[in-house]
Interface confidence: medium
């Protein structure tokens, strides 16, 4: 029974100086953020000024209503949700997608005619930035000019109208070499991506004043590399599910291992009325012990360990990811300046 | 003499041991970062794409040709410049500016007009993006046209002008709340900056029908928060120099020390003609020893350390700034994607 | 080089309908649009519709809606325009003229047909 | 319905002389503005496109400004061949001319 007693009184020893290390972490985090915060702003002590001159001087207007309208909602922590922003994998900005033949676009001798795109599940409509049709016209004799006429495909209308127009433009064209004219397609592509069933393929017309058609919709001997093609900007913020991203415990969590865990920094406690908005924002700090494989930043640290005659110290609990935060503040010239101050949140922690 | 030989070996020995262990460690990176990029990119294989193929698809056009010449000025690597971008500051985005008094800007009754801006240097020209002036106008009691006259105090002219216009516009206001205007002013901030001698100050003039001034100059009772204000965008990419920022070490360095080491990764000699760009790019990786408060990632990690008892065995050598590469690749299904690949450079090495 | 040959003057009744032609030579007419503008004696331009030969959809001014009628004969690369129920306020020189697109300004136009309406 | 309205509807001008025709759209066109110039017997000649694009074979003396609602048809130095009725057309959406401008010898 003696032996289950020390047991116990040992693991209580334990918690108790987990407890006391998480809690001088976390007073030496908050002494750190002070820090950073008039550090980074490039202040040599927090601004002072009344809440009353605040209150004076801060405009009620639009564009402070809109910044300070962002941290109505306060920043919510990243470890509520099951998914979180993805800063593994490839962000995609610009996708460059080439014709595909399509049974709606036959000419009546029963050639395919120029074009169809079939978009990758990538692309969704929200994230579209820039949508440009890049079509090729070949070289003219003679300076002339060019009537161009991008027009989509749409089902049959009752007055036999099979065609809506995207876009018409006129080009002078000089003698020489052909040429590559962009064409914004951003709305008609929202739209197919929207109803794909919409998305019936689109002519190219590029003609002469004699009614030539200069643009290369199929490509002829030596015109590899000429077909139309679209050229999409998108803003891509994957996600991915947060398993594997380390673990994030409580302030009761008996947990050893590496973990984040949660530090609310309130500026109002601090007297810091100088900062504008947020009032408060999370934190968050790292704390726990690092096994050689556990929770490695990158997928090769192991590796690396294995071989490692000096490091077998192990990797260290420390933030993997970090994030900035937004703040709106007076920096006492009577200026209010908003800004972004980097590396301010502990997303992630994890042994690296 | 035996002494100092065996002093040698074991010097010679210990330089062995640290040059086996860099080669492991770059062995294990390049082929950490072959599987990084595939998972990256969502590929379980590495395309099969033949280089007849792509010069087929490669469409012969500026935007492709725009992403490719990036990649022929080689990424330099960021250890050859004394100055870097600063992470650590905060950056500024948007700068409000309330008016104060001047001069030049005096009523024939000594009161202040309205209005006169002072200029922060943090403030240059050239990074201005966007300037506003924003005016409140007072409610109005009937539908009104309201004339507003922007116009800049310049030094008398010899014809006696002492104003020019930067801007009038004519606005049908409504009965009922008040309302904000913006006004765009950007080339003014931007010749006030580029010579400040000559920003003397700028008149608010808002007539209605009846001549009745609308704008808020002044505050009057219940009008604080209302005065004109400038709101400036500002794009802030602050620089600061590399020193404390990690040590940067060569093949042949002898530093024990936790260092960054080069390591260029060659996608040719991997047979990855899938990559259309780039063709290599400089990966580097970290390694060496690390003391308890030896170049730290954040102020306070020495602080936590101190009072550490189970992370004795102290912070370890890691990447602590890591850095995107930009990626033209195929990817199988007749599109191109130009994307952004997450923290696959090192740019600096710390203990954390 | 694209031109637009109209047909020759007409001298109607009021009430009666008037149909005057547009021929285009020199060009692929089922690029075109074609837009008829009548003038009357010592009055500016007043725009009446508008053909895309294309797809031979249509647009009229307000004014003529229900009264004009625009088509279009790709076999014979010629454009239309009917008028109906005339009175004597539609005496003018009636021109047709070519739109490189449906909102553009008219870079070619016809020589202009007479259309005198009297009792 | 979006008016043109074009003034003066007339001016007396020598040869030599600078001439500006304005022309006002009762709402935003943006630049979806052409000019034209006729003379007596004749078809209207496109002048200028885009509020401010010359026709290939216009004389440079002859120019285009604006945006919006407000425009002008500028002739630098009047030539004899010049005399003539000009007009401003909205080109956006249903088509819409101007009053027109009489350009005459004085």
């Known amino acids: 029974n003696e032996g289950s007693e020390r047991e116990e009184n040992v693991e209580k020893e334990g918690l108790c100086n987990a407890c006391a290390w998480r809690q001088n972490t976390r007073y030496s985090r908050i002494e750190a953020i002070k820090i950073q915060i008039l550090s980074k702003l490039r202040l040599e002590t927090a601004p002072n000024i009344s809440k009353d001159a605040i209150r004076q001087l801060l405009p009620r207007a639009p564009p402070l209503r809109e910044l300070i309208d962002q941290y109505d909602v306060q920043r919510d922590d990243s470890s509520d949700g099951s998914l979180e922003d993805d800063d593994y994998h490839a962000t995609t900005e610009t996708i460059i997608t080439m014709p595909t033949e399509s049974d709606f676009l036959m000419q009546a001798d029963g050639k395919p005619k120029c074009c169809f795109f079939k978009f990758s599940s990538k692309i969704q409509y929200n994230k579209v930035v820039k949508a440009q049709l890049w079509i090729y016209l070949r070289p003219v004799k003679t300076p002339t000019t060019v009537f161009v006429q991008i027009l989509r495909l749409i089902k049959p209308m009752k007055d036999g109208t099979r065609y809506t127009g995207i876009r018409s433009l006129k080009l002078d064209m000089s003698p020489g070499t052909g040429i590559w004219q962009s064409i914004d397609v951003k709305t008609v592509l929202q739209n197919w991506l929207k109803q794909p069933e919409s998305n019936l393929g689109i002519e190219i017309k590029a003609l002469d004043e004699n009614g030539h058609d200069l643009a290369v919709t199929f490509p002829g001997p030596g015109e590899d590399g000429l077909n139309p093609f679209l050229e999409v900007k998108v803003t891509d913020t994957p996600k991915r599910s947060r398993r594997d991203f380390g673990l994030d415990c409580d302030e009761h969590s008996t947990e050893s291992r590496c973990c984040r865990y949660p530090l609310t920094v309130d500026f109002e406690a601090f007297g810091w009325d100088w900062i504008i908005a947020p009032k408060r924002y999370k934190a968050n700090y790292c704390s726990g012990e690092c096994e050689f494989v556990f929770l490695q930043k990158y997928p090769h640290t192991h590796l690396v360990h294995q071989a490692n005659p000096r490091g077998s110290a192990g990797p260290c609990c420390t933030p993997t990811k970090m994030s900035p935060i937004n703040m709106l503040y007076f920096n006492g010239k009577e200026q209010i300046i908003y800004g972004k101050i980097p590396a301010m949140v502990v997303d992630r922690c994890g042994c690296s | 003499n035996e002494g100092s030989e065996r002093e040698e070996n074991v010097e010679k020995e210990g330089l062995c041991n640290a040059c086996a262990w860099r080669q492991n460690t770059r062995y294990s990176r390049i082929e950490a970062i072959k599987i990084q990029i595939l998972s990256k990119l969502r590929l379980e294989t590495a395309p099969n794409i033949s280089k007849d193929a792509i010069r087929q698809l490669l469409p012969r056009a500026p935007p492709l040709r725009e992403l490719i010449d990036q990649y022929d000025v080689q990424r330099d690597d960021s250890s050859d410049g004394s100055l870097e971008d600063d992470d650590y500051h905060a950056t500024t985005e948007t700068i409000i500016t309330m008016p104060t008094e001047s001069d030049f800007l005096m009523q024939a009754d000594g009161k202040p007009k309205c209005c006169f801006f002072k200029f922060s240097s943090k403030i240059q020209y050239n990074k201005v993006v966007k300037a506003q002036l924003w005016i409140y106008l007072r409610p109005v009691k009937t539908p009104t046209t309201v004339f507003v006259q922007i116009l800049r105090l310049i030094k008398p002219m010899k014809d006696g002008t002492r104003y020019t216009g930067i801007r009038s516009l004519k606005l049908d206001m409504s009965p009922g709340t008040g309302i904000w205007q913006s006004i765009d002013v950007k080339t003014v901030l931007q010749n006030w900056l580029k010579q400040p001698e000559s920003n003397l100050g700028i008149e608010i003039k808002a007539l209605d029908e009846n001549g009745h001034d609308l704008a808020v100059t002044f505050p009057g009772p219940g009008e604080d928060g209302l005065n004109p204000f400038l709101e400036v965008k500002v794009t802030d990419t602050p620089k600061r120099s590399r020193r404390d920022f990690g040590l940067d070490c060569d093949e042949h360095s002898t530093e024990s020390r936790c260092c960054r080491y080069p390591l260029t990764v060659d996608f040719e000699a991997f047979g990855w003609d899938w990559i259309i760009a780039p063709k290599r790019y400089k990966a580097n990786y970290c390694s060496g020893e690390c003391e308890f408060v030896f170049l730290q990632k954040y102020p306070h990690t020495h602080l936590v350390h101190q009072a550490n008892p189970r992370g004795s065995a102290g912070p370890c050598c890691t990447p602590t700034k890591m850095s995107p590469i930009n990626m033209l690749y195929f990817n199988g299904k007749e599109q191109i994607i130009y994307g952004k690949i997450p923290a696959m450079v090192v740019d600096r090495c710390g203990c954390s | 080089q694209v031109q637009l040959v109209q047909s020759g003057a007409e001298v109607k009744k009021p009430g009666a309908s008037v149909k005057v032609s547009c021929k285009v030579s020199g060009g692929t007419f089922s690029t075109f649009h074609i837009h008829w503008v009548r003038q009357a004696p010592g009055k500016g331009l007043e725009w009446m519709g508008g053909?895309?030969?294309?797809?031979?959809?249509?647009i009229y001014a307000q004014k003529f809606q229900g009264r004009v009628t625009m088509t279009e004969d790709t076999s014979t690369d010629t454009a239309y325009m009917e008028l109906s129920s005339l009175k004597s306020e539609d005496t003018a020189v009636y021109y047709c003229?070519?739109?490189?697109?449906?909102?553009?300004?008219?870079?070619?136009w016809g020589q202009g047909t007479m259309v005198t309406v009297s009792s | 319905d979006i008016q043109m309205t074009q003034s003066p509807s007339s001016v007396s001008a020598s040869v030599g002389d600078r001439v500006t025709i304005t022309c006002r759209a009762s709402?935003?066109?943006?630049?979806?503005l052409a000019w034209y110039q006729q003379k007596p017997g004749k078809a209207p000649k496109l002048l200028i496109y885009a509020a401010s694009d010359l026709l290939s074979g216009v004389p440079s003396r002859f120019s285009g400004s604006g945006s919006g609602t407000d425009f002008t048809l500028t002739i630098s130095s009047l030539q004899p061949e010049d005399f003539a009725n000009y007009y401003c057309?909205?080109?956006?959406?249903?088509?819409?001319f101007g009053g027109g401008t009489k350009v005459e010898i004085k």
């Open positions: 003229a070519r739109a490189r697109y449906v909102d553009d300004a008219f870079d070619i």
């Open positions: 053909i895309s030969a294309y797809s031979g959809s249509t």
């Open positions: 057309q909205k080109y956006i959406s249903a088509p819409s």
């Open positions: 709402e935003d066109i943006s630049n979806f």
